[in-house]
């Protein structure tokens, strides 16, 4: 069982100075995705603290993927901290906020939200249930937090996390100020299994964020949500890696056994924007 290949590595206060990330996705592992193309891309490595090259398969993957070394550095390295902190007051939205609404190719139509760049607000749209693009949010709040301008001119952010004391699961938490370290897996990994609207009975896997494991479920063949994987391995790769299991000074972070253990201290800091 590939889940057993994972272990908890304690994050201690020793050996390395605090790691401070500009964006949550900078903490994601390089993800080549399931496709077979060979594309040179860059990702930020939280262990070496540098932007490094990797080969991308051409589809899926995650946001820790950049066309150029410069773009990676701009988004993820501390050299740019001051510049980014300053520009947070008029911070650019993520690129995907400017994408057109995209219903995708499926026909299990559900209500989702997208940022409408013409009206400068989040609006509902008809989503087919698969594919499409990242300008696609399950809730109005998530869309607003990521793509709409906050009341003080900076982006309100929704990548912060808090530990749910009831079930020890991670839940998104809106933060009203930009956060230097925001660690969050793909949002759909937090959604419940959704059979969808059709009548098939396909074997699929979903990530159960309460127990922290990938579990099987029967998929109807259309609709549903993105927490839907054809194999357990794919589910684990997409959702389990990088999820913080307990947030505290000596918090835990999941790592693979095959990786050399590395100790990292993660500093949780927030910039409070003052009147200038």
């Amino acid at each position: 069982d590939s889940e057993e290949d994972e272990e908890h590595t304690i994050i201690t206060d020793t050996e390395l100075p605090p790691l401070k990330l500009m964006h949550s996705f900078c903490a994601f592992k390089a993800d080549d995705g399931p496709c077979k193309a060979i594309m040179k891309r860059f990702f930020f490595n939280i262990f070496t603290r540098q932007c490094e090259e990797f080969i991308y398969g051409g589809c899926e993957g995650n946001q820790n993927r950049f066309e150029s070394l410069e773009e990676c550095k701009k988004m993820c390295t501390r050299d740019n901290a001051n510049r980014i902190i300053k520009t947070t007051l008029q911070q650019e939205k993520p690129d995907f906020c400017f994408l057109e609404e995209d219903p995708g190719i499926c026909r299990g139509y559900i209500t989702r939200y997208f940022y409408n760049n013409q009206t400068k607000q989040c609006e509902r749209f008809k989503y087919g249930g698969c594919l499409g693009n990242m300008n696609n949010f399950e809730t109005l709040e998530e869309c607003k937090n990521i793509c709409e301008d906050g009341p003080n001119g900076f982006q309100v952010d929704n990548y912060g996390t808090q530990l749910n004391a009831v079930n020890n699961s991670l839940t998104p938490q809106s933060t009203k100020v930009p956060s230097l370290f925001e660690f969050h897996g793909p949002s759909w990994c937090l959604t419940p299994a959704d059979r969808g609207l059709c009548r098939a009975n396909e074997n699929r896997f979903y990530y159960n964020s309460v127990i922290g494991k990938c579990r099987p479920f029967k998929y109807s063949g259309c609709g549903g949500n993105e927490n839907n994987f054809t194999s357990k391995q794919e589910c684990l790769r997409a959702c389990k890696k990088g999820f913080i299991q307990r947030i505290s000074k000596g918090g835990l972070i999941k790592t693979k056994r095959k990786r050399k253990k590395q100790r990292v201290k993660i500093a949780y800091e927030e910039i409070f924007v003052k009147n200038m």
């Epitope: 299990g108 139509y109 559900i110 209500t111 939200y113 409408n116 013409q118 009206t119 607000q121 989040c122 609006e123 509902r124 749209f125 008809k126 809730t139 109005l140 959704d194 059979r195 609207l197 609709g223």
Partner: antibody
Framework: EVQLVQSGAELKKPGASVKLSCKAS????????MHWVRQAPGQGLEWIGE????????DYNEKFKTRATLTADKSTSTAYMELSSLRSEDTAVYYC????????????WGQGTTVTVSS | EIVLTQSPATLSLSPGERATLSCSAS???????LYWYQQKPGQAPRLWIS???ILASGVPARFSGSGSGTKYTLTISSLEPEDFAVYFC?????????FGQGTKLEIK
């Protein structure tokens, strides 16, 4: 004051088409969705589709996609619904109703247009 | 499509009594997307409750809504004469948007 004023009653023969209008006032027409909902005599409500006039975004109920056409005239703040190939079961009261861009709270409704299909 | 089934079809009660109207969905619907409308004879429907439990402007506090998943309820704690009408539940979580067939609340 927000108002949706619909056109008058229609009597049509099977196979014909009907075009209903809904004139909006008292709000920014292009900033809201306009829905069309029908109600057959003594029956429930059935959603036909919606149009957002600013960008011409339209969502249809698949059941009506081949027969219903939603349009909007921004200059007159008027929404239209045309239903073709009418049959007796299309006899109903047809309502227009507006909702915001973030939810489907149909907070204002027209008075309804009665369409009777009979040979 | 999601089918909303309302029960009972007709509910006969007297003023002062408690009314419980049910709405059952064929598939799970997020509570944020479940609304209720009131309709009186010869009138257009009126938005009554949004997001399962949020009363629309002007709706008396004797009305309440609850539920999650596939089961939703509209409750009137003590019926007043003006409450007798038809109530429709409505979902917009999935397309096409659908309504229940309605529960007619009539005076006994």
């Amino acid at each position: 004051e927000v108002q949706l004023v619909q056109s008058g009653a229609e009597l049509k023969k099977p196979g014909a088409s009907v075009k209903l209008s809904c004139k909006a006032s008292g709000y920014t027409f292009t900033s809201y969705w306009m829905h069309w909902v029908r109600q057959a005599p003594g029956q429930g409500l059935e959603w036909i589709g919606e149009i957002k006039p600013d960008q011409g975004r339209i969502d249809y109920n698949e059941k009506f996609k081949t027969r219903a056409t939603l349009t909007a005239d921004k200059s007159t703040s008027t929404a239209y619904m045309e239903l073709s190939s009418l049959r007796s079961e299309d006899t109903a009261v047809y309502y227009c109703a507006r909702s915001s861009v973030v939810d489907v709270a149909m907070d204002y409704w027209g008075q309804g247009t009665t369409v009777t299909v009979s040979s | 499509e999601i089918v909303l089934t309302q029960s009972p079809a007709t509910l006969s009660l007297s003023p002062g009594e408690r009314a419980t109207l049910s709405c059952s969905a064929s598939s799970s619907v997020s509570s944020s997307y479940l609304y209720w409308y009131q309709q009186k004879p010869g009138q257009a429907p009126r938005l009554w409750i949004s997001g399962t439990s949020i009363l629309a402007s002007g709706v008396p506090a004797r009305f309440s809504g609850s539920g999650s998943g596939t089961k939703y309820t509209l409750t009137i704690s003590s019926l007043e004469p003006e409450d007798f009408a038809v109530y429709f539940c409505h979902q917009w979580s999935h397309y096409p948007f659908t309504f229940g067939q309605g529960t007619k609340l009539e005076i006994k």
